[in-house]
């Protein structure tokens, strides 16, 4: 099939989870092809390594695309030390990397 | 690790998870053991646009996964989206309502 760029979404940790002392930030890459995609996490513009995990779906039987979730996991204390959370996505279907971000505590 | 039921947290739709006419929302199913869990949406009445990702094994020895669904953004304020999580090994069933974050 032809190249399909991912749709990228970012989710902050829920208030429920923060009450438990942990913060998971999720970046979703939806319906892309080919499978190769790179996700980089940045916290206050500092590149993160070693504290995220990725999971990729099987190839979709209808449109042959893939989807990927990347989860950045931090302690609540670490999460609350920083403001800007961003996932940067690189993929063949994107002319330049796409960044989705949010400011902690803001809608 | 001994048997442990998951915690289920909402991945709430917001302007950061909306693109044009599409909104994404989901559930984070975290810290369970052993595999597997099953996730459905609206008791199986919503299947189109659903992606339930393979579980990942965390450093804690517990599993975690996310299930997400894309929906028309126009539907967010008019109906309820619920993820139904079942972890048979711990006899845990959780129905989590996922709503737009109220600011």
């Amino acid at each position: 099939r032809t190249v399909a760029a991912p749709s990228v979404f970012i989710f902050p940790p829920s208030d429920e989870q923060l009450k438990s002392g942990t913060a998971s930030v999720v970046c979703l890459l939806n319906n892309f092809y080919p499978r190769e995609a790179k996700v980089q996490w940045k916290v206050d513009n500092a590149l993160q390594s070693g504290n995220s995990q990725e999971s990729v779906t099987e190839q979709d039987s209808k449109d042959s695309t893939y989807s990927l979730s990347s989860t950045l996991t931090l302690s609540k204390a670490d999460y609350e030390k920083h403001k800007v959370y961003a996932c940067e996505v690189t993929h063949q279907g994107l002319s330049s990397p796409v960044t989705k971000s949010f400011n902690r505590g803001e809608c | 690790a001994s048997t442990k039921g998951p915690s289920v947290f909402p991945l709430a739709p917001s302007s950061k998870s909306t693109s044009g006419g599409t909104a994404a929302l989901g559930c984070l199913v975290k810290d369970y053991f052993p595999e597997p869990v099953t996730v459905s949406w609206n008791s199986g009445a919503l299947t189109s646009g659903v992606h339930t990702f393979p579980a990942v094994l965390q450093s804690s020895g517990l599993y975690s996964l996310s299930s997400v669904v894309t929906v028309p953004s126009s539907s967010l304020g008019t109906q309820t989206y619920i993820c139904n999580v079942n972890h048979k090994p711990s006899n845990t069933k959780v129905d989590k309502k996922v709503e737009p974050k109220s600011c």
Epitope: - | N42, A45, S73, T78
Partner: antibody, heavy 110, light 110 residues
């Protein structure tokens, strides 16, 4: 932001027909889209919906009679073997109903 | 598919009067209901979505209410420009619901 349907014409029964919906001022690719029709002097009739990954849902009466598909820039409605009962104005619209095309007239007659 | 039953089929009221249109869904659709106004030769125009939320630019004389299976559109202080046919539509997103329209209500202004 607007939609426009094209492809409506006079056809004989059984002649395959494809209608196309295109958008101006916004990208169709992130929108669920509906096809709706209206026979002369009659009410609105939902045909089906296509979601962003190309999966379509149809009214029970439309299954097997119509096929909805999409590209990155268009949404198509195909009638494989139209009958005289399919004579109508066909509209495409966003799922939320806030944007409609003006409609395109299909006349099926021998 | 959800079936939408709309009543009455037609109604005639004087300028300044009030019209009430009812729409019943065959199963619960929460507040996933839209109301449209359509004039001859034009596509439908969205008036209300989410059962009660007024679309931008629509006068507050139009009021939607209801949830579950029973819905109402009320038009007060009728004006000549309100002469049109009004439709309800199920906008619930999920398997086997569909986005059916009610049969329409023709509103005439005396």
């Amino acid at each position: 932001q607007s939609l426009e349907e094209s492809g409506g014409r006079l056809v004989t029964p059984g002649t395959p027909l494809t209608l196309t919906c295109t958008a101006s001022g916004f990208s169709l690719s992130t929108y669920w889209m509906n096809w709706v029709r209206q026979a002369p002097g009659k009410g609105l009739e939902w045909i089906g919906t296509i979601n962003i990954d190309g999966s379509a849902a149809y009214a029970s009466w439309a299954k097997g009679r119509f096929t909805i598909s999409r590209t990155s820039t268009t949404v198509d409605l195909k009638a494989a073997s139209p009958t005289t009962e399919d004579t109508a104005t066909y509209f495409c619209a966003t799922y939320g109903g806030d944007i409609w095309g003006p409609g395109t007239l299909v006349t099926v007659s021998s | 598919d959800v079936v939408m039953t709309q009543t009455p089929a037609s109604v005639s009221e004087p300028v300044g009067g009030t019209v009430t249109i009812k729409c019943q869904a065959s199963q619960s659709i929460s507040t996933a209901l839209a109301w449209y106004q359509q004039k001859p030769g034009q596509p439908p125009k969205l008036l209300i979505y989410g059962a009660s939320t007024l679309e931008s630019g629509v006068p507050s004389r139009f009021k939607g209410s209801g949830s579950g299976t029973e819905f109402t559109l009320t038009i007060s202080d009728l004006e000549c420009a309100d002469a049109a046919t009004y439709y309800c539509q199920c906008t619930y997103y999920g398997n086997n619901y569909g986005n059916a329209f009610g049969g329409g209500t023709k509103v005439e202004i005396k």
